[in-house]
C-alpha cells in the first residue's frame, strides 16, 4: 500500500529500537570508515526526524523516499572526500543513481583493524556502564566489516550477544561462561555473512531469475509436502526480502521478513510439519529458526518424474506456453525428491534439461530427441559425489590443518596470482568443509559440502573482483554461478605463471610467534607455505612437506630456547638456506 510517509510507516511497523538499529547498520555498511560517534549522531537525527513524521505524516520532507532521506544524511558527512575519495562523487547524483553509487562502493575487505577482544572484566564493565552504547557498538563493528550482512539477522545476533553478557557478567567464572558464547557468535556470524554475500552476489551479478531458481530448489527440498504454488509464493516473497537487503533497503527488508515469517507460521499446515517449534518463538528467533529449519519428510509414493517431463507428449507444448513456470515445476519436483543433492547440482540438472528442451523442441521428432535426457544427468551427479568421497578420505587421513595445507598448495598452483592473504583465508575455509560435512551420512554430505563450497568460492570471487589479478578466477567467477565449483576443480597448475622472486624477508620469523594462539600460528605457517609455492610452483608435495616440517620444528625449538630472538635470527638464516637449496631457489 502507498503510505504518505515511508519513514513513518517503517518506524511504526518496526518500533523505535529496531528502527534505530537498522538505520545504524545501513549507515555503517555504506560508510565503513566513519567513527562510531558520527554514525550514532546521524542515526539520532534520522530517528528524531522519523518521530516528527509519525506525529504528522504531512510534515516537511516526510514524503521523501528512504533512499533520499538516508542519502541526504550520509552526504552531510564533512570528511567524505578525504575519507572515501571518489565515493564522495555519489553525492552529486540524484536517486536512484546515488544509492546505486553507494552500493558499488561497498568494500568486502575494508582496511579496518582486526577486532581485538578485551579482557572479560573490561567488557562486563563496559556492558554495565552503558548497555545501549555497548550493543550499538557491536552492530556498528560487525556491519562495517560485513557490508552485506543480513540486517534482520544481525538484530538476532545482537540479541544473543546481549543475552550472553547479561547472563555471564553475573556468573562466578565470567570467562568460562562468556568466551565460548562469543566464539560461537563470531563463528556463526562469519558463516552467516558469507552465506548472505552469496545471495547478494547471485542477485546482483546473475539477476533475479538465478536467485529465484536457487530459492525454488532450496525451498522445495525443505518443504517437499508444499504445493508448487505455495513454494512459488514463498520464493517471490523471499526474493523481495533479499533484493531489499542486498540493495541497502534494510527497513523494508526487515519489515517484509517479519511479514513472511508471519505468513509461513499462519500457513504451516500447507508448508511443513517441522515449523511448529519455530513458530512459537519471538520474532527474531522465529525468522532465524525458519531459515534454518530441517527438511520435512518427503511425501510417500511420489510418482516418477519421467511421466511429466520425458514421456508426456505435451512436454514441448507445456514448455512453450510458460518456459520458466515449466522449468520451475521441473526444479520443484526434482528438488523435493532429492534432499540428498546439493542445490547447485539441482540447478545444473535443470539447466541441462532446459538446454535439451531448447534444442529438441525445435527438432523434427522432439520426443525422440529428449527421450534420453535423464541419462545426461548421471555424470553430473557422479562428479560431486566422487569429489566429496575423495576429499573426505583425504580429510580423514590428514586432519583439518593438513587438509587445509593440501588445499592451499592445490589452489596456489591453480591461481598463484591471487594475494597470499586471500589464498590463506579461502583455503582455510575450504578445508573446514571436512569437519563440517564429512561426519554426515552419505545422504547429507553433498548438500552440506557443495553448497558450503559455493559460499566459500564466492568469498574468493568477491575479494578478487576488488583487485582482479587472474583471468582464470574471473572466468570461473563470472561464467556460471552454478558451475563455479566445477570450474575451479577443473583448473590445473597455471603453466603461464612466472615464479615470484625469492625474498628471504618473507621467511623471517621472530619470537612474537611464540605468544600467538594456535590458530594464528597456523596462519603464519600457511602464509609461508603459499609463498613457497609462489616461489617454486613445481615443488613436489614431498618437498613442501619437508620444508614445512622443518619450519614447524624450527618454531618449536626456538620457542623453547632461553634466548628466543637470537635463536629465530640464527636458526632462521640456516633454515632459509636449507629450504632454498632443497627447492633449488
Amino acid at each position: 500500500d502507498a503510505h504518505k510517509s515511508e519513514v513513518a510507516h517503517r518506524f511504526k511497523d518496526l518500533g523505535e529500537e529496531n528502527f534505530k538499529a537498522l538505520v545504524l547498520i545501513a549507515f555503517a555498511q555504506y560508510l565503513q570508515q566513519c567513527p562510531f560517534e558520527d554514525h550514532v549522531k546521524l542515526v539520532n537525527e534520522v530517528t528524531e526526524f522519523a518521530k516528527t513524521c509519525v506525529a504528522d505524516e504531512s510534515a516537511e520532507n516526510c514524503d521523501k523516499s528512504l533512499h533520499t532521506l538516508f542519502g541526504d544524511k550520509l552526504c552531510t558527512v564533512a570528511t567524505l572526500r578525504e575519507t572515501y575519495g571518489e565515493m564522495a562523487d555519489c553525492c552529486a547524483k540524484q536517486e536512484p543513481e546515488r544509492n546505486e553509487c553507494f552500493l558499488q562502493h561497498k568494500d568486502d575487505n575494508p582496511n579496518l583493524p582486526r577486532l581485538v577482544r578485551p579482557e572479560v572484566d573490561v567488557m562486563c564493565t563496559a556492558f554495565h556502564d552503558n548497555e545501549e552504547t555497548f550493543l550499538k557498538k557491536y552492530l556498528y563493528e560487525i556491519a562495517r566489516r560485513h557490508p552485506y550482512f543480513y540486517a534482520p539477522e544481525l538484530l538476532f545476533f545482537a540479541k544473543r550477544y546481549k543475552a550472553a553478557f547479561t547472563e555471564c557478567c553475573q556468573a562466578a567464572d565470567k570467562a568460562a561462561c562468556l568466551l565460548p558464547k562469543l566464539d560461537e557468535l563470531r563463528d556463526e556470524g562469519k558463516a552467516s555473512s558469507a552465506k548472505q554475500r552469496l545471495k547478494c552476489a547471485s542477485l546482483q551479478k546473475f539477476g533475479e531469475r538465478a536467485f529465484k531458481a536457487w530459492a525454488v530448489a532450496r525451498l522445495s527440498q525443505r518443504f517437499p509436502k508444499a504445493e508448487f504454488a505455495e513454494v512459488s509464493k514463498l520464493v517471490t516473497d523471499l526474493t523481495k526480502v533479499h533484493t531489499e537487503c542486498c540493495h541497502g533497503d534494510l527497513l523494508e527488508c526487515a519489515d517484509d521478513r517479519a511479514d513472511l515469517a508471519k505468513y509461513i507460521c499462519e500457513n504451516q499446515d500447507s508448508i511443513s510439519s517441522k515449523l511448529k517449534e519455530c513458530c512459537e518463538k519471538p520474532l527474531l528467533e522465529k525468522s532465524h529458526c525458519i531459515a534454518e529449519v530441517e527438511n520435512d519428510e518427503m511425501p510417500a509414493d511420489l510418482p516418477s518424474l519421467a511421466a511429466d517431463f520425458v514421456e508426456s507428449k505435451d512436454v514441448c507444448k507445456n514448455y512453450a506456453e510458460a518456459k520458466d513456470v515449466f522449468l520451475g515445476m521441473f526444479l520443484y519436483e526434482y528438488a523435493r525428491r532429492h534432499p540428498d543433492y546439493s542445490v547447485v547440482l539441482l540447478l545444473r540438472l535443470a539447466k541441462t534439461y532446459e538446454t535439451t528442451l531448447e534444442k529438441c523442441c525445435a527438432a523434427a521428432d522432439p520426443h525422440e530427441c529428449y527421450a534420453k535426457v535423464f541419462d545426461e544427468f548421471k555424470p553430473l551427479v557422479e562428479e560431486p559425489q566422487n569429489l566429496i568421497k575423495q576429499n573426505c578420505e583425504l580429510f580423514e587421513q590428514l586432519g583439518e590443518y593438513k587438509f587445509q595445507n593440501a588445499l592451499l598448495v592445490r589452489y596456489t598452483k591453480k591461481v598463484p596470482q591471487v594475494s597470499t592473504p586471500t589464498l590463506v583465508e579461502v583455503s582455510r575455509n575450504l578445508g573446514k568443509v571436512g569437519s563440517k560435512c564429512c561426519k554426515h551420512p552419505e545422504a547429507k554430505r553433498m548438500p552440506c559440502a557443495e553448497d558450503y563450497l559455493s559460499v566459500v568460492l564466492n568469498q574468493l570471487c568477491v575479494l578478487h573482483e576488488k583487485t582482479p589479478v587472474s583471468d582464470r578466477v574471473t572466468k570461473c567467477c563470472t561464467e556460471s554461478l552454478v558451475n563455479r565449483r566445477p570450474c575451479f576443480s577443473a583448473l590445473e597448475v597455471d603453466e603461464t605463471y612466472v615464479p615470484k622472486e625469492f625474498n628471504a624477508e618473507t621467511f623471517t620469523f621472530h619470537a612474537d610467534i611464540c605468544t600467538l594462539s594456535e590458530k594464528e600460528r597456523q596462519i603464519k605457517k600457511q602464509t609461508a607455505l603459499v609463498e613457497l609455492v609462489k616461489h617454486k610452483p613445481k615443488a613436489t608435495k614431498e618437498q613442501l612437506k619437508a620444508v614445512m616440517d622443518d619450519f614447524a620444528a624450527f618454531v618449536e625449538k626456538c620457542c623453547k630456547a632461553d634466548d628466543k630472538e637470537t635463536c629465530f635470527a640464527e636458526e632462521g638464516k640456516k633454515l632459509v638456506a636449507a629450504s632454498q637449496a632443497a627447492l633449488g631457489l
Epitope: E542, K545, V547, A552, A553, E556, A582
Partner: nanobody, 123 residues
C-alpha cells in the same frame, strides 16, 4: 661427529616383514631429522622415509606408504623401520641418514650416513 650403524637386514620371503634399526652415537641424536634411503643394484639412491626429531612428523615415499612405518626412540638414540608386506622391488641396500633439516635429507644430501644393510626379498 655422529656415527650411524644400521642392523636388521636379511633375506625374507615376499609378503614377509623385517625391522631395521639405526643406532646413533656422538652428538645429540634428538636434534636430528633421521631418515632411510635405499639403493638397488644399478639404480639411483631412493628416499624411503624420514622422521623429525620430536617424532611428530613423518614422511614416506609413495612406493612404501601403508607398508612401512618409521619410528624413533630418543632415549635409546635409535631409529627403526618396520617393513611389512615386502615385495621383490624392495630389495636394496638400506641406508640410515641424519641431518638438521628434512628438506636437506630428502634430496639425499644429509650430513651423516651409515654404511647400509642389505635387504633381499625373494619370491
Amino acid at each position: 661427529q655422529v656415527q650411524l650403524v644400521e642392523s636388521g637386514g636379511g633375506l625374507v620371503q615376499v609378503g614377509g616383514s623385517l625391522r631395521l634399526s639405526c643406532a646413533a652415537s656422538g652428538r645429540t641424536f634428538s636434534n636430528y631429522v633421521m631418515g632411510w634411503f635405499r639403493q638397488a643394484p644399478g639404480k639411483e639412491r631412493e628416499f624411503v622415509a624420514y622422521i623429525h626429531w620430536s617424532g611428530s612428523s613423518t614422511s614416506y615415499a609413495d612406493s612404501v606408504k601403508g607398508r612401512f612405518t618409521i619410528s624413533r626412540d630418543n632415549t635409546k638414540n635409535t631409529m627403526y623401520l618396520q617393513m611389512n608386506s615386502l615385495k621383490p622391488e624392495d630389495t636394496a641396500v638400506y641406508y640410515c641418514t641424519a641431518d638438521q633439516y628434512a628438506s636437506t635429507l630428502l634430496r639425499a644430501a644429509g650430513e651423516y650416513w651409515g654404511q647400509g644393510t642389505q635387504v633381499t626379498v625373494s619370491s
